[in-house]
């Protein structure tokens, strides 16, 4: 999806970044997580999205577009406040709910044009639409009360194109799905694969008996289980090969000496 124009570019384009690390190239690092992050692009003078692998990398990496802009674009906050004063509700606020094709379970928020309020919905993880926000506050700022928004509407870029199943928005999620915090599974820093691989086998709610495979994160192997045909979770594969392909690659041997916090 194409990013929207950034009105601050023409004013700030020729200026130097605030910090030397803002001039560094995006570095996704050697690990295999898929964490949506942002970096300052010296050539375009914009903050842009990239996929961070979850380890190493450099300082030109931010969790949010806003944080990137505040850190690397001189005078951004003043410009943002100025642009916000005349904000209108963007068109995508009026898009209908679209959970997307995939079957993740992600708590998201959308603007409901009938009730004129931001409401919670479940996003599946891929190919949805832009009326999809990670927080209630973000939804309200952009769609409910755009006039009072502390950031301009035209700053709504890839952070709001949450239509993809391959990127994530903060360190507690992978593929936009919150990773279950359980003492029985490897710690999240040790596992950089698809988060549903950490979920327990779930046979579902129906009455069928289908042979399926799930990834056991404790053993690092895929095991058979009976699936009843509906419900359940995404740790559910039709073949052992698909199970291993999807989940085995995420296990990382911890090479660091210190305790991971």
């Amino acid at each position: 999806l194409s990013e929207e124009a950034d009105d601050t570019d023409s004013e700030l384009g020729s200026m130097k970044p605030l910090h030397t690390f803002c001039a560094m190239k995006a570095d996704d690092g050697p690990c295999k997580a898929m964490i949506r992050s942002y970096f300052f692009n010296m050539y375009t003078h914009q903050c842009e999205e990239f996929i961070y692998g979850g380890c190493e990398g450099n300082e030109n990496r931010f969790d949010t577009l806003e944080e990137c802009k505040k850190t690397c674009i001189p005078g951004y906050e003043k410009t943002a406040v100025k642009a916000a004063s005349g904000a209108e509700r963007p068109d995508f606020c009026f898009l209908e709910e679209d959970p997307g094709l995939c079957r993740g379970y992600m708590k998201r928020y959308l603007y409901n044009n009938q009730t004129k309020q931001c409401e919670r919905f479940v996003y599946g993880g891929c190919l949805g639409n832009r009326n999809n926000f990670e927080t209630l506050d973000e939804c309200k700022k952009i769609c409910e009360n755009p006039v009072h928004s502390p950031s301009p509407v035209n700053e709504v870029q890839m952070s709001d194109y949450v239509t993809d199943g391959n990127t994530v928005t903060d360190r507690s999620t992978v593929n936009n799905i919150v990773v279950p915090q359980s003492p029985k599974v490897p710690r999240r820093r040790d596992y950089r694969g698809r988060p549903w691989c950490l979920q327990p086998a779930d046979s579902g709610l129906c009455k069928a008996s289908e042979r399926r495979f799930y990834y056991n994160s404790a053993t690092g192997k895929c095991h058979r289980f009976n699936y009843t045909g509906c419900g359940g979770n995404n740790n559910n594969f039709t073949t052992r090969r698909r199970c291993l392909r999807s989940c085995k690659t995420g296990l990382i041997k911890n090479k660091s000496k210190g305790v991971v916090k």
Partner: antibody, heavy 125, light 107 residues
Framework: QVQLQQSGPGLVKPSQTLSLTCAIS??????????WGWIRQSPGRGLEWLGH?????????SYAVSVKSRITINPDTSKNQFSLQLNSVTPEDTAVYYC???????????????WGQGTLVTVSS | DIQMTQSPSSLSASVGDRVTITCRAS??????LNWYQQKPGKAPKLLIY???SLQSGVPSRFSGSGSGTDFTLTISSLQPEDFAVYYC?????????FGQGTKVEIK
């Protein structure tokens, strides 16, 4: 084995409505593990996704911006089929139209694994 | 939309040749890429999904690799039935988009 069988006219006049149907066998249009889409192909545009529908406790659709104001994709559960309607067509809409199934949803990858045979639709007076 | 650019747009090769087709995305799409083969008058046929997974029934001479923005489809030993047009497709972002195609012709 999933099969998709397309039907509909091959010639449509400008400003009229293009209507195509895709009959499904071997799967259900209201399956939780699939989605059903339309793609068209023309020499000028190549392969272009137009939209899809899917059922996840209720019906959802998603349409390409380029045709959003003119397109409707509807399911017909009684006949296990889905249809494409494209209003106000112009010669630019001349293309081979395909219906297809988004598969792989259970396993975390998605792809068009089954396609209809294609229908050449010519928009001409 | 994410633009998918394939190269070359066409190539001539002989039976037994190793053929490589590349696909470049205008943005990072991780490994969310599929490859299709299309023969004249037919619908596209899925070859590879998720960058490197071979679809059931597809010969093992087809393989895929890549990550991020650069992807490759390789045919290790071209067979007579492989002369066709090949398309990549990204599904990382909505809308899903296809490459313009690479035609593999007989030399």
């Amino acid at each position: 084995q999933v099969q998709l069988q397309q039907s509909g006219p091959g010639l449509v006049k400008p400003s009229q409505t293009l209507s195509l149907t895709c009959a499904i066998s071997g799967d259900s249009v209201s399956s939780n593990g699939a989605a059903w889409g339309w793609i068209r192909q023309s020499p000028g545009r190549g392969l272009e996704w137009l939209g899809h529908i899917y059922y996840r406790s209720k019906w959802y659709n998603s349409y390409a911006v380029s045709v959003k104001s003119r397109i409707t994709i509807n399911p017909d559960t009684s006949k296990n089929q889905f249809s494409l309607q494209l209003n106000s067509v112009t010669p630019e809409d001349t293309a081979v139209y395909y219906c297809a199934r988004w598969g792989g949803i259970h396993d975390g990858d998605i792809y068009f694994d089954y396609w209809g045979q294609g229908t050449l639709v010519t928009v001409s007076s | 939309d994410i633009q998918m650019t394939q190269s070359p747009s066409s190539l001539s090769a002989s039976v037994g040749d190793r053929v490589t087709i590349t696909c470049r995305a205008s943005q990072n799409i991780s490994n969310y890429l599929n490859w299709y083969q299309q023969k004249p008058g037919k619908a596209p046929k899925l070859l590879i999904y998720g960058t490197s997974s071979l679809q059931s029934g597809v010969p093992s001479r087809f393989s895929g690799s890549g990550s991020g923005t650069d992807f490759t489809l390789t045919i290790s030993s071209l067979q007579p039935e492989d002369f066709a047009v090949y398309y990549c497709q990204q599904y990382g972002n909505n809308p899903t988009t296809f490459g313009q195609g690479t035609k593999v012709e007989i030399k």
